[in-house]
Each structure stands twice: as C-alpha cells, then as structure tokens.
C-alpha cells in the first residue's frame, strides 16, 4: 500500500470498520518526528492525528476513530509544512476485522457445531481450522456467518481448534486482512482438553489470504 | 444482460452547462452495492473519470471538477445523469456512462455505454 | 491523484504474437488494479480485475499479474479482434485513475 512519493512506505488497516491505523517507514525521515494530517471530507480542512504511534521515540503511524465509515480517507503526511506523502484511499480496501468472540463449540457424535457471536456487519466468512495431532496440515472449513459444523471427525482423537473472520474478497477487494486467530481450543471426546499430546505449536496466521 | 445508452445534446455552447442521462436497462440502479459512473475521453487522450452515484443516492466527483458537476438519479426512469457547469471547449470529450463491479465496493467498471460525443463550440 | 503510467503508448505485432503490455502507479495500490479493452466504436471492456483475476467470458489468452507499483497485461497469442487500445485503472485511491492507454496495432 506504500508510495513511492520521497521513499515513503505505508500501511493502511481498518480495523473492524471503527478505527483505521496508518503507518510509515521513512528512511529519509527516520529521526524525523513526521506528521500527520486527514480529513474524512474533501471539502473539510485537515485536522493533525491526536493519537500517534512511536517508534524508537519518534512518530511512526496514526490512529484515527472511523467508526463505521464507508468512505475516503485523505491524508498527508508531512515534514513541518512539506508534504511527505499525500494520498486519499476508500478505507473499506484495508479491513481488518475483528476477532471472533465467544466461541463456542457444541458435539453431536462425530460433528461439532462452531459457534461465534457474528459481527455487525455483513460479507464476511467465518473460518475454523482444526487438526489433529495425526494431520500433517489444518484443515478448514468456512461459513458465512459463525455457525460452522465440521462433520466426519474421530470421537477419539484430540483435536484443536481456532477460528477468525475473513472479508469477503467479491466485496472488499483482495487486499484486506483476516482477523487474529481465537484462541486455540482442545477437545477430545466432547470434552475441552488443556492440549491436545503431541500438537505442533500451531502456525502463526498470515495476513495474505 | 445490463445495458447502458447515453443520451443528451451533441452541441453546446461555452458557458452554458452541459447535460447528458444515462438511461439503464436489465438492471435496478438500486442495485445494493452497485455504483454508476460518469467517464469522458477527450480526443486522442485517455480515460477520466468523473463522478459516480450510489445506490443509495451518495455522490462522489472528482476533485478537479467537483465545483461543475453534479449527478443524479431518476428511480422511477431508472436514469441518472450528468450536469457539467461552464463549459469550456476543454470539456469536448466523448463522455461515458458506466457501472462499478460490486467488489471492493467501488472499482472496476464492468459495463459501459457506447459513448456519446459532445462539442463545446459558439 | 495516483498517477498511473503505461508503455509501451502504441504497439505494432503480428497475429499469434505474444504480447505484455505493462502499468506502473505512482503509489502502491495492492493487486487493486484493472485492465479494459476498447475498440474503436464499441463499449470499453473489462478484461482482468484486480490484477490477476479474470473475467467470464474475456478468452483465457488475456492474463494479468503484478502488485504495487508493477502491472502487466499478457495476450498469450493475439488474435484479429485483439487489435484494440488497452488501458489500466486502479481503484483504491481515490479518484480513479486510468493510464493513457496503449494502442495495438496490425505489424
């Protein structure tokens, strides 16, 4: 998402449609406390971010509240009065929603029901990843709200479990990010387990899809 | 099968303002999620992008005319158009009516009108 | 505005030719960028979304790759009706831009 304007680098997320986060890596400026300007109206003046994020002592990002604002974000970074960076972008592009919120999992014999309080918004898929520790890899299963049910599982294996919710491509675009992952959760038996023997560490979620 | 047809005068005079409806059929310009663009193409250059209307009737003009535009819709027609204030002979363009894919919410354009030329000239 | 530039601006190649045509912009735009073919007299048309994706109905010879800054449109072998200009568009800046078009013409 970074510029190539005077070497500025940027990242732009939107977290859950309430607060967009923009971050810089100004190696020109790197002892340089920058600025930065926005506005969510083009025909508003600019107001400079209140919130700044730190890096070895100096500025390095902004956090703006955006709550539930589908639209445009202009903004300037600058160097005292200079402009380092200029841009305006539709925030919807960077979404990062939330992570799931009370998950709950609920056993039929060989099937468990995942369950997770699906957020406000729409367009988005809700994905469970589970393994056991005789899968080599997860494996997943995606709905589109939280309301999963993974079929054909062992009564008798471990298995651990987490979840996160993803944009919909169709509708955000592919350059969105999923949510953290919930944390994992290990059952046996239809009973949560403190782990599940001999699990790998589970991998860390990337932010590509 | 979505089609779009541009419609409106051919000739105008500088100063005056410049109107064009894009009229929309096989499709709701209701359409949740789906956004309708104005598009001109001065002769022998490239794209511009002008404005575009939601489907809930938001706008959004492209800052370099957002002073001399205005779009708008007819539900009932299922119409919306295009009002260009002042024109100057800058403004001879073919001029497009054009709808935005449903992704990312407002991107690519996947169905377009034929065109229609309009003339800034006394 | 996000400035987005093509190359070549005019191309001359044979039918069953491979050809890329390649878009560069002015500040990273992800893979949010759109390739449309326009021949003269006709409606402008979309051919790969978002870099790489493509469209139903668009022949599987047109492809599409690149993020960033970077783009490329391929014409796998060119064929008659492909002789057409060929623009770029990104869309999350706002507004949207397009590139000044590349012109394919019969060698």
């Known amino acids: 998402q970074g510029g190539a304007a005077e070497g500025v680098q940027i990242q732009i997320i939107y977290f859950n449609l309430e607060t967009v986060q923009v971050t810089w890596n100004a190696s020109k400026y790197s002892r340089t406390n920058l600025t930065f300007h926005y506005r969510f109206n083009g025909d508003e003046a600019y107001d400079q971010c209140t919130n700044y994020l730190l890096q070895e002592g100096h500025t390095s990002g902004c956090l703006l509240d955006a709550e539930q604002r589908d639209d445009i974000l202009y903004f300037s970074i600058r160097n005292g009065t200079h402009p380092v960076f200029t841009a305006s972008r539709w925030m919807v592009y960077y979404l990062k929603p939330s992570s799931p919120k009370h998950v709950r999992f609920s056993w039929h014999q060989d099937a468990v029901t995942v369950t997770c309080s699906d957020l406000s918004y729409g367009d988005l898929l809700y994905e469970v990843q589970y393994r056991s520790p005789f899968d080599t890899e997860w494996q997943s299963k995606q709905e589109n709200t939280c309301n999963v049910t993974i079929e054909g599982l062992d009564a008798e294996k471990c298995y651990s479990f987490w979840v996160r919710v993803k944009a919909m491509e169709d509708v955000y675009g592919p350059d969105t990010y999923p949510s953290d992952w919930s944390e994992v959760t290990c059952w046996q038996r239809g009973e949560i387990r403190d782990a599940c023997a001999e699990t790998p560490t589970p991998p860390k979620p990337k932010l590509s899809k | 099968q979505v089609q779009l047809q541009e419609s409106g005068p051919g000739l105008v005079k500088p100063s005056q303002t410049l109107s064009l409806t894009c009229t929309v059929s096989?499709?709701?310009?209701?359409?949740?999620?789906?956004?309708w663009s104005w598009i001109r193409q001065h002769p022998g250059k490239g794209l511009e992008w002008i404005g575009y209307?939601?489907?809930?009737?938001?706008?959004y003009y492209s800052p370099s005319l957002k002073s001399r535009v205005t779009i708008s819709r007819d539900t009932s027609k299922n119409q919306f158009s295009l009002k260009l204030s002042s024109v100057t002979a800058a403004d001879t363009a073919v001029y497009y009516c054009?709808?935005?894919?449903?992704?990312?919410?407002?991107?690519?354009?996947?169905?377009w009108g034929q065109g229609t030329l309009v003339t800034v000239s006394s | 505005d996000i400035q987005m530039t093509q190359s070549p601006s005019s191309l001359s190649a044979s039918v069953g030719d491979r050809v890329t045509i390649t878009c560069r912009a002015s500040q990273s735009i992800g893979t949010s960028l759109h390739w449309y073919q326009h021949r003269p007299g006709e409606t402008p048309k979309l051919l790969i979304k978002f870099a790489s994706r493509s469209i139903s109905g668009v022949p599987s010879r047109f492809s599409g790759s690149g993020s960033g800054t970077d783009f490329t449109l391929t014409i796998s072998s060119l064929q008659p009706e492909d002789f057409a200009t060929y623009y770029c568009q990104q869309s999350p800046g706002f507004p949207p831009t397009f590139g000044q078009g590349t012109k394919l013409e019969i060698k």
């Open positions: 054009a709808r935005s894919l449903y992704g990312g919410y407002k991107d690519a354009f996947d169905s």
């Open positions: 096989g499709f709701s310009i209701t359409t949740s999620g789906y956004y």
């Open positions: 209307i939601g489907y809930n009737s938001k706008t």
